[in-house]
Amino acid sequence: RRDVAHGILNEAYRKVLDQLSAGKHLQSLVARGVGGSLGGGAGDDAEPLSKRHSDGIFTDSYSRYRKQMAVKKYLAAVLGKRYKQRVKNKGRR
């Protein structure tokens, strides 16, 4: 049962991480000046990806920001204290 729970948790976070890497891909496109304006669609991620943050992720949505923080917390739990310290130092910048 524990393995199933871990599987569900990992799957959920894999989806979130997929979203974030898609966001990073968009970010690199923006940095290279590729394509037109972002956002405007009616899909699941139709938020404008316009504001830059210390961790290099674009977001204008508070719920997306919370998802990013959840990913950080999850990675800290999985990867341990050293990762958490790195995350903390980055957040303080």
């Epitope: 699941d44 961790d55 949505s61 508070y62 719920s63 923080m69 995350v87 957040g91 303080r92």
Partner: antibody, heavy 117, light 112 residues
Framework: EVQLVQSGAEVKKPGESVKVSCKAS????????MHWVRQAPGQGLEWMGL????????RYAQKFQGRVTITADESTSTAYMELSSLRSEDTAVYYC??????????WGQGTLVTVSS | DIVMTQSPDSLAVSLGERATINCKSS???????????LNWLQQKPGQPPKRLIY???TRESGVPDRFSGSGSGTDFTLTISSLQAEDVAVYYC?????????FGGGTKVEIK
């Protein structure tokens, strides 16, 4: 019982800085988002920024960018809001508020900061 | 920033009568996660604000059922179905969907 207890009233001169504290209890501090909101006398509410204590990530309102610093001390479950280069328009009650679900479920009692020469 | 426009600025209602406060946002508050982060606060003189309604229509536990929230997208309403003396306060809507988080200007509710 969830509680947010803020530091006492402050009187400051223009150009100075103020640091307000907010001590949290009754919940897991690192699992929350701590926000700061201010209210000038007889005016409405204004969001200043937030901190996620677990990672120390912050997000500030554009209006206060460069002038506000929000920090958190996990060991004491205390959040701090420092506002610099104070001017008379910064006279207000400053509130901390906790968010679990995309909304401010609990608020501190408020800290009056008076800026006067 | 999202502009939150509340109306009216003040409202005088007889005890037992209905009070209706409107809140309009300059952009849809429906988030990608399917929730609408529109909230209603009540603030009495000398006190911090208190959460009444979150997610547009979910009542905070312990809040009397005479308070209800409705609406979607950009148009929202707080209704007090039967005004009581203890409901005299300023009511604020605010949005938690988009940064920067923003508040309406408030509606002062008084007894006629």
């Amino acid at each position: 019982e969830v509680q947010l207890v803020q530091s006492g009233a402050e009187v400051k001169k223009p150009g100075e800085s103020v640091k307000v504290s907010c001590k949290a209890s009754g919940f897991t501090f690192t699992d929350s988002y701590m926000h700061w909101v201010r209210q000038a006398p007889g005016q409405g509410l204004e969001w200043m920024g937030l901190i996620y204590p677990f990672s120390a990530d912050t997000r500030y309102a554009q209006k206060f960018q460069g002038r506000v610093t929000i920090t958190a001390d996990e060991s004491t479950s205390t959040a701090y809001m420092e506002l610099s280069s104070l001017r008379s328009e910064d006279t207000a009650v400053y509130y901390c508020a906790i968010d679990y679900d995309g909304s401010f479920a609990y608020w501190g009692q408020g800290t009056l900061v008076t800026v006067s020469s | 920033d999202i502009v939150m426009t509340q109306s009216p600025d003040s409202l005088a209602v007889s005890l037992g009568e209905r009070a209706t406060i409107n809140c309009k946002s300059s952009q849809s508050l429906l988030d990608a996660d399917g929730k609408t982060y529109l909230n209603w606060l009540q603030q009495k003189p000398g006190q911090p604000p208190k959460r009444l309604i979150y997610w547009a229509s979910t009542r905070e536990s312990g809040v009397p059922d005479r308070f209800s929230g409705s609406g979607s997208g950009t148009d929202f309403t707080l209704t007090i179905s039967s005004l009581q003396a203890e409901d005299v306060a300023v009511y604020y809507c605010w949005q938690g969907t988009w940064f920067d988080l923003t508040f309406g200007g408030g509606t002062k509710v008084e007894i006629k």
